[in-house]
């Protein structure tokens, strides 16, 4: 249904409210150095515009195109060239260029500083002085250090930022109350930035059939009991949500987002068992909730996956018919029954099945060619299962630091150009997969571990794209997008590798140290592991260990010591040379 | 390679019941879809019925609906197939077959028993 003003039609279909935040990230994620009074006035400027279309939707300019209204506000920007170097050349293109080309400079990892949290009483303050200025500058960090971010999530996260500080700042111990929830939103926002960076790097790097497949396999789990074509139905609209919301049109995204879970409420009858209490919700916690739905159960009487895709004569004849809508069906059915696999593994088998298919259909004996094709499945199901069996045995005996210690030093070697502030994030989110994972039940632990090392691998292949350092990282990132896992863990030592040359300042500390929390101290350490392994690859774990034990030892004893600055010059030269003879440096 | 072992078959009246069990060895079942099939007399091998890997779905041949229950327990590596309501016409060999992370199927399965005599009089 064409609109005389699209602008017109998503102001009133989103409200105000929303519209201005929606807005205000969309703005943030593009242009990402911008001070916030900037983009306050950008935003304010379009809310009046379009409430002059609301009016009139024939007046003038309001039959423009979102991306035409948002880049010539964007290109207005007196300091564009200055801040943003080449991407002002954006603005002497067209749309849809000139959208695009702004989408290329999005930076995953942008030279912003780090958000420090002001004291408590401050935030307080600040809260009950302006309330609406603090949310929305709560939008604006969030959205330019994080420019892929769901944006109609982003929404449901601000509003409960905003309802802490509503509870909390009337507590009778206010930090009690509201720091452990400002880390919980800090902790699932970051979760929820990587998943949904994911999301649009799958639908960028290897586009729309990757995303379907990806989102067949994961609603089919979660709703096993819907019939193929509800399923489809729900994937079409969900790949046209986050399209949208990839490619910068929020408003869009975030309308077509309500649209998608009042239709699934509709329906939850002939989708799951599992919606009635995320559908009695208000939108944006409706939308969360229907997102992080638990799998319903699976039917009953499910009949074997074999008389359709393998003993069919028909297999050949219903492939060439449709192949897409075939192999669909074929990971519908797989994964309705499958809540146990991985979507990567689901998809590496449908994979393996359009492959038979292919091979076969054009042989003399098509059915003797593929009747044995689910014997090829053996090997790729217990490829994951005793890997995650194995690191959960690990984790279980190491705990989560020095698990990811052991992890640094093995995707270090494995990667050793890669930077190592990258290498510290990358492993430290790898690690966390066991405290995620391991606690599960075997029948959980498969699709938790997996899935969570699909969205930690593709922080690495984005912070990588950015400035490619290593031939192993770049084809293991662009050769297949459900194979990324295992390419990575396939990796053995990089024996072209040129060891670093020693550099006694990295391994010089100061007093600072002790003052650090305990997860900025860790950092730290790993930071030094990291750089121990790039001087000394072929280093043994035991020779590591050592070291790091000596490390840990000598910031506890220097920490105590009455005059720390001098015990960490004279003891820390002590360290470094006899780490340099542990390592044979 | 995984082995199975029926047991607990025999000779039962007509209306009677009988429980049979096929134990697994040789690997854990709960990558498996479990079955059972069965050959009467001079007749062909038949397809009775099949069990998904964690027991949530169940699929029978329409001769046994109602009639016959399978469960598994994973935990001891085995499967079971609950026989009531006997007719004379269920008599005959019943094999335990497993199949690699489906159900499996008359012709469709990766291992099977050397199977249990059943006999309805």
């Known amino acids: 249904d064409a609109h005389k003003s699209e602008v017109a039609h998503r102001f009133k279909d989103l409200g105000e409210e929303n519209f201005k935040a929606l807005v205000l990230i969309a703005f943030a994620q593009y242009l990402q150095q911008c001070p916030f009074e900037d983009h306050v006035k950008l935003v304010n400027e379009v809310t009046e515009f379009a409430k002059t279309c609301v009016a009139d939707e024939s007046a003038e300019n309001c039959d423009k195109s979102l991306h035409t209204l948002f880049g010539d506000k964007l290109c207005t920007v007196a300091t564009l060239r200055e801040t943003y170097g080449e991407m002002a050349d954006c603005c002497a293109k067209q749309e849809p260029e000139r959208n695009e080309c702004f989408l290329q400079h999005k930076d995953d990892n942008p030279n912003l500083p780090r958000l420090v949290r002001p004291e408590v009483d401050v935030m307080c303050t600040a809260f009950h002085d302006n309330e609406e200025t603090f949310l929305k500058k709560y939008l604006y960090e969030i959205a330019r250090r994080h420019p892929y971010f769901y944006a109609p999530e982003l929404l449901f996260f601000a509003k409960r930022y905003k309802a802490a500080f509503t509870e909390c700042c009337q507590a009778a111990d206010k930090a009690a109350c509201l720091l452990p929830k400002l880390d919980e939103l800090r902790d699932e926002g970051k979760a929820s930035s990587a998943k949904q960076r994911l999301k649009c790097a799958s639908l960028q790097k290897f586009g729309e059939r990757a995303f379907k497949a990806w989102a067949v396999a994961r609603l089919s789990q979660r709703f096993p009991k819907a019939e193929f074509a509800e399923v489809s139905k729900l994937v079409t609209d969900l790949t046209k949500v986050h399209t949208e919301c990839c490619h910068g049109d929020l408003l869009e995204c975030a309308d077509d987002r309500a649209d998608l879970a009042k239709y699934i409420c509709e329906n939850q009858d002939s989708i799951s068992s599992k919606l009635k209490e995320c559908c009695e919700k208000p939108l944006l916690e409706k939308s969360h909730c229907i997102a992080e739905v638990e799998n319903d159960e699976m039917p009953a009487d499910l009949p074997s996956l074999a008389a359709d895709f393998v003993e069919s004569k028909d297999v050949c004849k219903n492939y060439a018919e449709a192949k897409d809508v075939f192999l669909g069906m074929f990971l519908y059915e797989y994964a309705r029954r499958h809540p146990d696999y991985s979507v990567v593994l689901l998809l590496r088998l449908a994979k393996t099945y359009e492959t038979t298919l292919e091979k076969c259909c054009a042989a003399a004996d098509p059915h003797e060619c593929y009747a044995k094709v689910f014997d090829e499945f053996k090997p790729l199901v217990e490829e994951p299962q005793n890997l995650i069996k194995q690191n959960c045995e690990l984790f279980e005996q190491l705990g989560e630091y020095k698990f990811q210690n052991a992890l640094l030093v093995r995707y270090t070697k494995k990667v050793p150009q890669v930077s190592t502030p990258t290498l510290v994030e990358v492993s430290r989110n790898l690690g966390k997969v066991g405290s995620k994972c391991c606690k599960h039940p075997e029948a959980k632990r498969m699709p938790c571990a997996e899935d969570y090392l699909s969205v930690v691998l593709n922080q690495l292949c984005v912070l990588h794209e950015k400035t490619p350092v290593s031939d192993r990282v770049t084809k293991c990132c662009t050769e297949s997008l459900v194979n990324r896992r295992p390419c990575f863990s396939a990796l053995e030592v990089d024996e072209t590798y040129v060891p670093k040359e020693f550099n006694a300042e990295t391994f010089t500390f100061h007093a600072d140290i002790c003052t650090l929390s305990e997860k900025e101290r860790q950092i730290k350490k790993q930071t030094a592991l990291v750089e121990l392994v790039k001087h000394k690859p072929k280093a043994t774990k035991e020779q590591l260990k050592a070291v790091m034990d000596d490390f840990a030892a000598f910031v506890e004893k220097c920490c105590k010591a009455d005059d720390k600055e001098t015990c960490f010059a004279e003891e820390g030269k002590k360290l470094v040379a006899a780490s340099q003879a542990a390592l044979g440096l | 390679d995984v082995q199975l072992v029926e047991s607990g078959g025999g000779l039962v009246q007509a209306g009677g019941s009988l429980r049979l069990s096929c134990a697994a060895s040789?690997?854990?079942?709960?990558?498996?879809?479990m079955g059972w099939l069965r050959q009467g007399p001079g007749k062909e091998r038949e397809f009775v019925g099949s069990i998904n890997w964690n027991g949530a779905t169940t699929h029978y041949a329409d001769s046994v609906k109602g009639r016959f229950i399978i469960s598994r327990d994973n935990a001891k590596n085995t499967v079971y197939l609950q026989m009531n309501s006997l007719k004379p016409e269920d008599t005959g060999v019943y094999y335990c077959?497993?199949?690699?992370?489906?159900?499996?199927?008359?012709?469709?399965?990766?291992?099977r028993g050397q199977g249990t005599q059943v006999t309805v009089s």
């Open positions: 077959v497993a199949q690699f992370s489906v159900q499996p199927t008359l012709q469709t399965y990766d291992y």
């Open positions: 040789g690997g854990t079942i709960s990558n498996y879809g």
